[in-house]
């Protein structure tokens, strides 16, 4: 912390400008009025202050606003935002999407920092839900944002917000997250026609149940292998060879390359070998002809 000393004669800052870059830390502390700084925060962003000088400016704002900065200051923090700790940010009440965008812009190109995560958390909690505009903004800056949320947090996403989600936003989502998102997507896109619907729903299919996959197989969707490989294993297993063939269309040939990987491997083990042979792909590992398949899970349910 900079010790308190009187400002030298003639050095009192009348405005926040480039003349301050050659002030020592103690001079900034002594000669820059915190209230002036607060009203001219937008100027700080254009001045090449050193990281030490930015520390002093932050300290001045902390003294002026011990309970947390007002949004009028937060919106113009610029690079000073990178100096904030999560503890600082927890004191803020950020309600404007413009403020959120301004601060995310400062961190653009970097990984999501603890500061940014705290800021987003404060913002979303303040809004009560992840509305479309917020989700749009967050995924634009952090494509992986959606997949960083817990299934519980995702449950607060309204179906209308799903329209803002791009395929790359779901790249790192695990099945538990897709289980929550898929029904919302299904609801959001329900009024679209077949081919358009499939284009939109495709990224969410890792959360789809068997009956929805069966329904899709009747619509000539030609699902690609990458999408098929992301489907829930328990949803794929009950599909018949004919259904998988319809679901994949011309992409069915790709099953051969994936026969040792889930869910294809597990699905093959559940199919009759003579049914697999109808595909003409040389898939091996199905149930030999003449064998009886007992569904023990069904038996347990009945007993």
């Amino acid at each position: 912390e900079v010790e308190k000393t009187a400002c030298p004669s003639g050095k009192k800052a009348r405005e926040i400008d480039e003349s301050l870059i050659f002030y020592k830390k103690w001079e900034l502390e002594a000669c820059v009025d915190a209230a002036l700084l607060a009203t001219q925060m937008d100027r700080v962003n254009a001045i090449p202050f050193t990281y030490e000088q930015l520390d002093v400016l932050k300290h001045k704002l902390d003294e002026l606003y011990p309970q947390g900065y007002p949004e009028s200051v937060i919106q113009h923090l610029g690079y000073l935002f990178l100096k904030m700790s999560p503890e600082d940010i927890r004191k803020w009440n950020v309600t404007s999407l413009e403020t959120l965008k301004a601060l995310l812009e400062v961190n653009k190109g970097h990984e999501m920092s603890p500061q940014v995560a705290t800021l987003i958390d404060r913002f979303v909690k303040g809004r009560g839900q992840l509305d479309k505009d917020t989700l749009d903004t967050l995924t634009a800056f952090y494509p992986g944002y959606l997949c960083s949320l817990s299934p519980e947090e995702l449950s607060s996403v309204p179906p209308s917000s799903i329209w803002a989600v791009r395929p790359q936003d779901l790249d790192t989502c695990d099945p538990r997250q897709l289980d929550v998102l898929y029904p919302k997507a299904r609801l959001a896109f329900q009024n679209m026609n077949g081919s358009e619907y499939f284009v939109k729903i495709q990224s969410f299919l890792g959360g789809a149940p068997t009956e929805d996959l069966k329904a899709l197989s009747q619509q000539n969707v030609s699902m690609d292998l990458a999408t098929f490989m992301k489907l829930r294993t328990d949803a794929v297993l009950p599909l018949t060879v004919a259904e998988v063939q319809k679901l994949l269309g011309p992409h069915v040939e790709g099953l051969k390359a994936e026969e040792r990987h889930r869910p294809v491997r597990d699905w093959i083990l559940r199919q009759r070998q003579d049914d697999l042979d109808t595909l003409g792909l040389g898939l091996q590992g199905g149930i030999p002809n003449g064998y009886l398949v007992l569904d023990l899970s069904m038996q347990e349910a009945l007993s």
């Epitope: 030298p8 050659f22 090449p48 050193t50 030490e52």
Partner: antibody
Framework: QVQLVQSGAEVKKPGASVKVSCKAS????????MNWVRQAPGQGLEWMGV????????SYNQKFKGRVTMTRDTSTSTVYMELSSLRSEDTAVYYC????????????WGQGTLVTVSS | EIVLTQSPATLSLSPGERATLSCSAS?????MHWYQQKPGQAPRLLIY???KLASGIPARFSGSGSGTDFTLTISSLEPEDFAVYYC?????????FGQGTKLEIK
């Protein structure tokens, strides 16, 4: 140890532009501001401006405003100084110089780049 | 901008003698730095913040002053000290340097 290595000598025609680079090593590039200082043959030192490598913010000597542009590439720890509309009086050795802790002068300098402006 | 005037322009002394170089500012300055430059070399920081010795600089160099008048003193000249010396104000934008004092062997 701290090192600032500058690009080689340049010969330019009046009206042209020159871009001099300064590659930093031996310290955290984004922690210190980088300044540019020039020295005409047999003359004194003249401060041209400063860039914050972390944010890319700059401050230029009014004398060069509109002609000088300082940029940086954090991926290669390099700062650049571009001077446009060159005239014969811009013939000088151009130095990059690292600012030190709390404005304690320029403790580290590049080796200098001679820019000759001649028709 | 703050104009720095160094005096004398040239100082002729012998090794072992004491050298006193002056730098006068056109308006009050918070801090002054001093640099040494030899032909074909980049400047080298000697004194920062008016009176602090830069890293690796011999103790025979010292700085003093305040306001508009600053001094660099070399207590006993060594052969390697003969060079050009520049003052630089660190107070006002733009930074400015003096025109230099050439210290030559008598």
């Amino acid at each position: 140890q701290v090192q600032l290595v500058q690009s080689g000598a340049e010969v330019k025609k009046p009206g042209a532009s020159v871009k001099v680079s300064c590659k930093a090593s031996g310290y955290t590039f984004t922690d210190y501001n980088m300044n540019w200082v020039r020295q005409a043959p047999g003359q004194g030192l003249e401060w041209m401006g400063v860039i914050n490598p972390n944010y890319g913010t700059t401050s230029y000597n009014q004398k060069f405003k509109g002609r000088v542009t300082m940029t940086r590439d954090t991926s290669t720890s390099t700062v650049y100084m571009e001077l446009s509309s060159l005239r014969s009086e811009d013939t000088a050795v151009y130095y990059c110089a690292r600012g030190d802790y709390d404005g304690a002068g320029f403790a580290y300098w590049g080796q200098g780049t001679l820019v000759t402006v001649s028709s | 901008e703050i104009v720095l005037t160094q005096s004398p322009a040239t100082l002729s002394l012998s090794p072992g003698e004491r050298a006193t170089l002056s730098c006068s500012a056109s308006s009050s300055v918070s801090y002054m730095h001093w640099y040494q430059q030899k032909p074909g070399q980049a400047p080298r920081l000697l004194i920062y913040d008016t009176s602090k010795l830069a890293s690796g600089i011999p103790a025979r160099f010292s700085g003093s002053g305040s306001g508009t008048d600053f001094t660099l003193t070399i207590s006993s000249l060594e052969p390697e000290d003969f060079a050009v010396y520049y003052c630089q104000q660190w107070s006002s934008n733009p930074l400015t340097f003096g025109q230099g004092t050439k210290l030559e062997i008598k």
